[in-house]
Interface confidence: low
C-alpha cells in the first residue's frame, strides 16, 4: 500500500518536527533511523525514507553519488513526510542504482544517512 | 491483515494514572511510527505523541506537559500510552494510531471521575 | 503551535450535492494535511494525504486540493455513507494538529 508516513513499506510524516515544551527549548537534530539499503528490479518503484526531526524543523536535502537529486516529473521525486522526507523513484532503470544520501540541517548541526540502491 | 487492537475501557480518579495498550499484528511494529490521539465527548481529535519502535523515540505534544509516557514492548508487538495526574478535562477515547494514520485502534475509554 | 480551522463547521446536504469543505492553517504547512472521515462512535478514516493524494480504498468522488495555508476537501456527488464529521490534520510542524471538524448532516 502507498502511504506518506513510513520505511520501505510505508512512508512517514514531515520535516519540519518542532517541540516548544520547556524541555525541548534547546535546538537539537536526531537521525530516528539510519537510512535502509534496497534491492528491487528493472521498471519497479524505489522509496528511500530520511527519518529525522529537529528543532528548529531542519531542512533536507538528497543526494545521488555526491551530486544533489535532481527531481524528474512524475518519476523522481522527494517531499517532506510527517518524519523527515522520502525520495521516490518510479520506472526503475540500471542507471538509478547508487549511493543515496540525506543531509539534514537545522541551521547549527547537520546530520545524514546513507542508503544504497542496487 | 493489519490490526491494532486496544485495552479496554478504565475510569479513573482525578490525580490517578492510566496506561492504554494497543497490540499490532499484521506488520512489523518496529518500523512503523505509532501515534496516540485522543477525542473529548464532542472534541476535535487531539494529537499526544509517537513512539518509533525500533528504537524507542518519543515525540510528543507540550500541551501535555510531561504527563504522557509512551513506551513499547516489541516481543509482545505492544505499545502503550500512560496519562497521569488525570483530570476530569481527560475523559476521553484514546485511540493508537499506526504512523501514516491509515490504520487505527478501536479506541479506548478514559473516564475521569471523583 | 498550527491553529487549523475548518468551514463551514456544519451543514446539511442532498444525497448527489457537490459538497466542498475548506481547512485553513495559521502559517504555511505546504501540503502537509491529510483528511479523515469519522462516522458517530466509529474511528477517523483516512480520506486524503499529502493534500491531494487518494489513500487507498477510497472513491474517487472525494478529491482535495491546495498548499500553504488553504486547503478543499471535495466530494463529487455525496452520498448517503457520506453524511459524518470530516476532520484536517497538519503534519507539517509539532504538535501535530487536527480542525475543528465539518459535521455534514442530511437535509
Known amino acids: 500500500q502507498e502511504t506518506e508516513l513510513s520505511v520501505s513499506a510505508e512512508l512517514v510524516p514531515t520535516s519540519s518536527w518542532n517541540i516548544s515544551s520547556e524541555l525541548n527549548k534547546d535546538s537539537y537534530l536526531t537521525l530516528d533511523e539510519p537510512m535502509n539499503n534496497i534491492t528491487t528490479s528493472l521498471g519497479q518503484t524505489a522509496e528511500l525514507h530520511c527519518k529525522v526531526s529537529g528543532n528548529p524543523p531542519p531542512t533536507i536535502r538528497w543526494f545521488k553519488n555526491d551530486a544533489p537529486v535532481v527531481q524528474e516529473p512524475r518519476r523522481l521525486s522527494f517531499r517532506s513526510t510527517i518524519y523527515g522526507s522520502r525520495l521516490r523513484i518510479r520506472n526503475l532503470d540500471t542507471t538509478d542504482t547508487g549511493y543515496f544520501q540525506c543531509v539534514a540541517t537545522n541551521g547549527k548541526e547537520v546530520v545524514s544517512s546513507t542508503g544504497v540502491l542496487f | 491483515q493489519v490490526q491494532l487492537v486496544q485495552s479496554g475501557a478504565e475510569v479513573k480518579k482525578p490525580g490517578a494514572s492510566v496506561k492504554v495498550s494497543c497490540k499490532a499484528s499484521g506488520y512489523t511494529l518496529t518500523t512503523n511510527y505509532m501515534h496516540w490521539v485522543r477525542q473529548a465527548p464532542g472534541q476535535r481529535l487531539e494529537w499526544m505523541g509517537w513512539i518509533y519502535p525500533g528504537n524507542g523515540n518519543t515525540k510528543f505534544n507540550h500541551k501535555f506537559d510531561g504527563r504522557v509516557t509512551i513506551t513499547r514492548d516489541t516481543s509482545a508487538s505492544t505499545a502503550y500510552m500512560e496519562l497521569s495526574s488525570l483530570r476530569s478535562e481527560d475523559t476521553a477515547v484514546y485511540y493508537c494510531?499506526?504512523?501514516?494514520?491509515?490504520?487505527w485502534g478501536q479506541g479506548t475509554l478514559v473516564t475521569v471521575s471523583s | 503551535d498550527i491553529q487549523m480551522t475548518q468551514s463551514p463547521s456544519a451543514m446539511s446536504a442532498s444525497v448527489g450535492d457537490r459538497v466542498t469543505i475548506t481547512c485553513q492553517a495559521s502559517?504555511?504547512?505546504?501540503?502537509?494535511l491529510i483528511w479523515f472521515q469519522q462516522k458517530p462512535g466509529k474511528v477517523p478514516k483516512r480520506l486524503i494525504y499529502?493534500?491531494?493524494s487518494l489513500a487507498n480504498g477510497v472513491p474517487s468522488r472525494f478529491s482535495g486540493s491546495g498548499s500553504g495555508t488553504e486547503f478543499t476537501l471535495t466530494i463529487s456527488s455525496l452520498q448517503p455513507e457520506d453524511f459524518a464529521t470530516y476532520y484536517c490534520?497538519?503534519?507539517?510542524?509539532?504538535?501535530?494538529?487536527f480542525g475543528p471538524g465539518t459535521k455534514v448532516d442530511i437535509k
Open positions: 499529502f493534500a491531494t
Open positions: 502559517q504555511d504547512i505546504g501540503n502537509n
Open positions: 494510531a499506526r504512523s501514516d494514520f491509515d490504520y
Open positions: 490534520l497538519q503534519y507539517r510542524e509539532y504538535p501535530l494538529t
